[in-house]
Interface confidence: medium
């Protein structure tokens, strides 16, 4: 019932009815990659569709069988550049739309033909299962192998050298030359460094089989360890065009008993908040010793260390003990910016009885922390354009038309969801089910292009988005102006070329503006009408009389000038979109010698 | 000169043994995987099975598996064919191959004839 | 794991151009890039004339040509010779266990 405070409307029902989710395989074409490779899924290889139209529904896919010659990976942190990649058996089709699943060839055994993973999967919606799905991963059979790859035995922290006694690849199909191999490092040891010359290599560097010919390529533990240790680092050979399977090295650290033990545990504090730094986050101890000073190398970025119950805020703590620590003296005090981590590198020295002592010893790391983002900013319109649009017709929206922004850190803006309303004068409706409405979709959706306005009555109008970011909402108008179809390219198109020299045509010079519904550049065409005098229009490397937008966005026209004194030329263009077409001219200035 | 070339032509009785050869010559034996083929007479081209010579390993044919066995001894560039028990199906000429890359066979030998009759 | 299928019989006269057509399956000619084709004469063993769908080995003559649509791979023979006259063989990798298929055999005849 709905009252203005005075007055009450009669009562209204809501029926709400639950039908049963129905799950269809839309897509399952499986992937094709090198051993030794990784692949994402994405959904133009793996998609189910529901019954659940409008409806933001959760799918989840389950590995239900032992995989035999990889993995299957989700990436952690939302996706972001460089996060960790995870072996999981269950993912959501949101994570395969985000790019966020792969498969990882892990076989590293000489095949003589490709191979094919099979992957069992079983898909839920609801209270929904799906069965027997069958996902086929061919695997191209690597052709470089290894001859030789025996485990590595250090002590501590020296230096020993790779030698080709430890790794040594050979080539199927060798012939009368020997290939040179490159080894890619595809995870570097955790527990030490690869070196080639006395340089670290990181994921993705490398180094060749000549390298360890020369004795260039060595491994030294990072730390003394009290203990034996293990350490590893994954590897592939390429000899191009050939590869091999990913691999693994393995390296046998021995073990020092009186090497420090060092504890070093992520602090987790709220976003402009603080957080103990306890003896459980931070401590080094040995065998024969327990007392050790810390030293702070670089103040924190983003907060600082101060003694806990200190009210001034101007100093910082830049050394403290083991009994700092396990008194719980200090803390880490965040400023209350928008971020996700902030280190502190330190070095923690073994405190001698006397000045006489041994040399002291030292314990190098950084230690981290993690702020824990509060949702305190509502999104932001980054992006707001009338949306023209043929009368009668469709176009796509997308994020060129309205875009938002959140300022929170850890928030990617495509997860950013909006809603509109009812529309008299149209609606807005799935690209790849135009027949349904929709009403709910993400600023990923329309980043996608998944998302199509369809044009019916009223010539002008506003559609309200309600934008919301999951705790916060913004709303924003978007005027919808439809009219005839038209094209138009920007008056006074111009390009300045040097004398005998070219120019490139591009999107910039030749700029287009459309109310069609044009989803691909090879669907504008361009034919030159008259001109030019004084040079040639060249695409691809040939003379041309024609091109398309798609030319124009991948750069492929130019203008040639013919070497002549003539400081401009002129071409003039029909442009044509489907039954659409439209005149247009282009300025040719020559910056003469 | 690459080249391959196999043991003479074989008359044998149901029930014996018989291993044929395949020696390689004119490039580096090891590095390639030779396959085994089998023609019946006035038949087509029946895939049988293929090893590499540099570690051994092996795969059959299902159809193959279990009725021969393929082996090599590098340090003579030679690869074999065996029948531990020939039948009068059998009967056939037996071509090795050497595979290069995605699968095709560059270089043929000339031929086994096996003939298994009682 | 059935053979791929090829025309039993295929003929020409000399300096026509004949096609030999290989259906197989998406496991196989449809799936892969990998579709070879052999030349016999009768008592001799047999000889690579096409690799890799379309590629041609050195010393093989420029007239023999290879091309594949969908699950078809097809062998063009083009100006005919009586040399030509022999099998015809195509094979391709599979996905299936047997992991190497040949098609049936095909007998160019070159008349006249």
């Known amino acids: 019932r709905v009252s203005d405070g005075l007055q009450a409307s009669p009562p209204a029902t809501l029926k709400v009815v639950a039908i049963r989710p129905a799950i269809q395989i839309h897509r399952s074409t499986g992937l094709r990659l090198a051993q030794g490779s990784a692949m994402p899924i994405l959904p133009a290889n793996l998609s189910v569709e529901t019954n659940a139209v409008g409806q933001d529904v959760s799918v989840l896919f389950r590995v239900t069988g032992a995989l035999q010659f990889g993995e299957l990976q989700k990436q952690g942190a939302g996706g972001v550049e460089g996060a960790e990649w995870w072996a999981t058996q269950a993912f959501h089709q949101r994570d395969v739309e985000q790019g966020r699943v792969r498969y990882l060839s892990t076989d590293p055994q000489h095949h003589a033909y490709d191979t094919v993973e099979n992957l069992a999967l079983e898909v839920q919606v609801g209270q929904e299962i799906l069965s027997n799905l069958s996902f086929p991963v061919t695997i191209q059979r690597a052709t470089v192998w290894m001859l030789r790859l025996e485990p590595l035995h250090t002590q501590n922290t020296q230096q020993e050298t790779l030698t080709t006694a430890h790794l040594e690849a050979t080539l199927e199909e060798a012939g009368p030359s020997p290939p040179t191999f490159h080894y890619e490092v595809v995870q570097a040891p955790r527990k030490g460094n690869l070196q080639l010359q006395g340089t670290r290599l990181s994921d993705g560097q490398g180094f060749t089989q000549d390298d360890i010919q020369a004795g260039r390529v060595t491994y030294g533990a990072t730390a003394r360890a009290s203990e034996a240790v293990e350490d590893t680092f994954r590897f592939r050979v390429t000899a191009p065009p050939y590869f091999s399977p990913l691999y693994t090295f393995p390296i046998h650290i021995g073990g020092d008993p009186d090497a420090p033990v060092l504890t070093n545990v992520l602090l987790v504090v709220p976003e402009g908040g603080e957080g103990v730094l306890s003896a459980d986050h931070l401590f080094v101890k040995s065998l024969n010793s327990a007392s050790y000073l810390y030293e702070v190398m670089e103040r924190p970025r983003h907060g600082r260390l101060a003694w806990r119950g200190t009210q001034d805020k101007t100093t910082m703590v830049t050394s403290f003990t083991n009994e700092d620590l396990l008194r719980g003296r200090l803390v880490y005090q965040h400023d209350d910016s928008e971020t996700t981590e902030d280190d502190i590198p330190f070095v923690a020295t073994r405190q001698g009885e006397s000045s006489g002592d041994m040399a002291w010893e030292e314990v190098r790391g950084v230690f981290r922390v993690a702020i824990q983002p509060v949702n305190d900013h509502a999104p932001v319109q980054t992006i707001s354009r009338i949306f023209h649009v043929a009368r009668g017709g469709r176009r796509l929206l997308t994020t060129d038309d309205v875009a938002f922004s959140d300022a929170d850190s850890g928030f990617a803006d495509a997860q950013l969801v909006l809603t509109r309303k009812d529309l008299l004068f149209g609606s807005i409706v799935a690209v790849d089910e135009p027949t349904r409405p929709i009403y709910r979709f993400t600023q990923e959706d329309l980043r996608k292009r998944r998302v199509l306005f369809v044009h019916s009555g009223a010539d002008r109008g506003w559609i309200q988005l309600q934008v919301s970011d999951g705790q916060h909402q913004a709303t924003a108008l978007l005027e919808v102006q439809a009219s005839e179809p038209y094209l138009r390219v920007a008056n006074g198109s111009s390009l300045v070329v040097p004398q005998g020299g070219q120019g490139t045509i591009d999107t910039a010079v030749l700029h287009l503006d459309t109310n069609l519904d044009i989803r691909s550049g090879d669907e504008v065409h361009y034919h030159v009408t008259a001109g030019p005098r004084w040079g040639q229009l060249v695409r691809a490397g040939q003379p041309a009389t024609a091109f398309s937008q798609q030319d124009l966005l991948d750069g492929a026209v130019l203008y040639s000038h013919n070497g002549s004194l003539s400081p401009r030329d002129t071409m003039a263009f029909s442009v044509e979109a489907g039954p659409v077409h439209t005149d247009a001219t282009l300025q040719v200035t020559i910056a003469l010698e | 000169e690459v080249q391959l070339v196999e043991s003479g032509a074989e008359v044998k009785k149901p029930g014996d043994s018989l291993k044929i050869s395949c020696k390689g010559s004119?490039?580096?034996?090891?590095?390639?995987?030779i396959g085994w083929v089998r023609q019946m007479p006035g038949k087509g081209l029946e895939w049988m099975g293929i090893i590499y010579p540099g570690d051994s390993e092996t795969t059959y044919s299902p159809a193959f598996q279990g009725d021969v066995t393929i082996s090599v001894d590098k340090s003579i560039s030679t690869a074999y064919l065996q029948w531990n028990s020939l039948k009068a199906s059998d009967t056939g000429i037996y071509y090795c191959?050497?595979?290069?890359?995605?699968?095709?066979?560059?270089?043929w030998g000339n031929g086994t004839l096996v003939t298994v009759s009682s | 794991q059935s053979a791929l299928t090829q025309p039993a019989s295929v003929s020409g006269s000399p300096g026509q151009s004949i096609t030999i057509s290989c259906t197989g399956t998406s496991s196989d000619v449809g799936g892969y890039n990998y579709v070879s084709w052999y030349q016999q004469h009768p008592g001799k063993a047999p000889k690579l004339m096409i690799y890799?769908?379309?590629n041609r080995p050195s010393g093989v003559s420029n007239r023999f040509s290879g091309s594949k649509s969908g699950n078809t791979a097809s062998l063009t023979i083009s100006g005919l010779q009586a040399e030509d006259e022999a099998d015809y063989y195509c094979?391709?990798?599979?996905?299936?266990?047997?992991?190497?298929?040949f098609g049936t055999g095909t007998q160019l005849t070159v008349l006249g």
């Open positions: 004119g490039y580096s034996f090891t590095s390639y995987w």
């Open positions: 094979s391709s990798y599979t996905s299936s266990s047997t992991r190497y298929v």
């Open positions: 890799d769908v379309s």
């Open positions: 191959a050497r595979r290069r890359g995605n699968y095709y066979m560059d270089v």
